[in-house]
Amino acid sequence: SNNSFTNFKLATELPAWSKLQKIYESQGKTLSVKQEFQKDAKRFEKLNKTFTNYDGSKILFDYSKNLVNDEIIAALIELAKEANVTGLRDAMFKGEHINSTEDRAVYHVALRNRANKPMYVDGVNVAPEVDSVLKHMKEFSEQVRSGEWKGYTGKKITDVVNIGIGGSDLGPVMVTEALKHYAGVLDVHFVSNIDGTHIAETLKVVDPETTLFLIASKTFTTAETITNANTAKNWFLSKTGNDPSHIAKHFAALSTNETEVAKFGIDTKNMFGFESWVGGRYSVWSAIGLSVALYIGYDNFEAFLKGAEAVDNHFTQTPLEDNIPLLGGLLSVWYNNFFGAQTHLVAPFDQYLHRFPAYLQQLSMESNGKSVTRGNVFTDYSTGSILFGEPATNAQHSFFQLVHQGTKLIPSDFILAAQSHNPIENKLHQKMLASNFFAQAEALMVGKDEEQVKAEGATGGLVPHKVFSGNRPTTSILAQKITPATLGALIAYYEHVTFTEGAIWNINSFDQWGVELGKVLAKVIGKELDNSSTISTHDASTNGLINQFKEWM
């Protein structure tokens, strides 16, 4: 594959990499954050960065509780320069084909170009086309929300069912949950899993006369989505006198494949397209976000886009030392490759963000779960972290034990909005939530040594059980409020963190060949499940499982 974007094969070849290994040995692994605060009265001032959104709202990113000092930050920035992160970034923003294995541009950033500046792919300005799809989404969502768009019996639409998987599901699910406060007249449901339970349970609660189905599939060939879509269509027809003409009022497609959409029976006027330069996991900004626009209203959807656009502007225009996503990505590389950390925890102290870690899991792990560099050689270093998380304070009662006292380093991001959408009981709940947000980060940093434990009255064999090492790194992300603009900014922040990691590891963060093999084998096995014969074509384990399944099915 053609790769003209980087001039190194492996990150380990870069001089700053060796420098960082030495710094890790001499000071990184033994660094005491508590002592760093004592040594440098300006540490917080230097290591917290405030992002100002397009609407003037702010998000504070506090990196000061991380295992870094001035020298380490300087060496990490040197690494970013040597890896030419800014060069790759600029190539992405210019619409160049940085997805080298599929020879495609990576241009999700063009979807939130609300300034409507010219953005080119292969010599074509895509801004007008993006704008035209957004206008179509605005028009359609406003018609449906206002009741002007009616179902086949003349009733208003009350429910929207989005059928998609992966990028065509996770984004809209997460965003609609996160922005539930902004919901209006419609209920929205999401069907993703091929497990029949998912569609069956959804169809139990909706009315064919007032339901709009959105079939979300870039290719319109995704097995799970098309199977679920056909099931929905069959259910709809069976409830509506088997009249295919009714489909037009109740089915829309979010896809790039006009032929397949028409073949399915959807009027292509109700098709919302997007381009091949939009990757699935980056597609919530595109027509795939139609369910979001329907749920929270187009104006809020646009604010969501503008929040992301503001982070894009920050990422492209801010010097490296103050570049918030770049610093986030560099810290991730620091922990992953020098401390041997294998995971990254994202804990939103916000119930509305309960699907945010799942969304980031796909963003990060599908992007950077790669072993081959842009130079077509296998890496000799660790790449993509295992990202996980749950909302706090729930998480404090499950896996935080391991974060505090386990034998693994788990760099963590804590997210809180200062203003709750539900400031009930005179803000009592919000204050309790916030106190935990501050306390957890502090506890992970300061720990508790043997002397303190003994001073608190513990004796004998109990003492070591109550000791906390401290120096467990956290980044605290404090927003003013979770608004559409804030959420857009947070997602774009993590997109560019992921980009930065991938650029330093010199991997292609924009393909996903790893999902192919299982899909191919599933097709083969699917045919074998259609007959009653005993299967012997696989390994003994797979044969045994298939045959037992067939016996029990």
Partner: nanobody, 122 residues
Framework: QVQLVESGGGLVQPGGSLRLSCAAS????????MAWYRQAPGKQRELVAV???????NYADSVSGRFTISRDNAKNTVYLQMNSLKPEDTAVYYC????????????????WGQGTQVTVSS
């Protein structure tokens, strides 16, 4: 890498004294327990004395009252003052340290020195 280097061994007459020292070098966060072990020819290695980071000490019955273990945390060094030496104290003396490698981790790794020979003979 962590290195432990012992010194101070040698030949001494019964009733005499020796002071062994062991210095830890390399990159680590801190040292938890530091200890001295010994191994006489044809015998198992046995614990002689141990000193915790808090300064608390423990001795084998055979050396109690004659040997004193101490440490200098600033120098990452442990000492063994051996008085009233007996022929049965003849052995190779090994320094052992339980080291906390990283600031964030409580897990201790075990490190040994190469050993220093102590011979008590007239």
């Amino acid at each position: 890498q962590v290195q432990l280097v012992e010194s101070g061994g040698g030949l001494v007459q019964p009733g005499g004294s020796l002071r062994l020292s062991c210095a830890a070098s390399g990159s680590f966060f801190n040292i938890n327990a530091m200890a001295w072990y010994r191994q006489a020819p044809g015998k198992q290695r046995e614990l002689v004395a141990v000193i915790a980071s808090s300064g608390r000490t423990n001795y084998a019955d055979s050396v109690s009252g004659r040997f004193t273990i101490s440490r200098d945390n600033a120098k990452n060094t442990v000492y063994l003052q051996m008085n009233s030496l007996k022929p049965e104290d003849t052995a190779v003396y090994y320094c052992n340290s339980k080291i906390r490698q990283a600031s964030w981790n409580l897990v201790l790794s075990d490190h040994w020195g190469q050993g220093t020979q102590v011979t008590v003979s007239s």
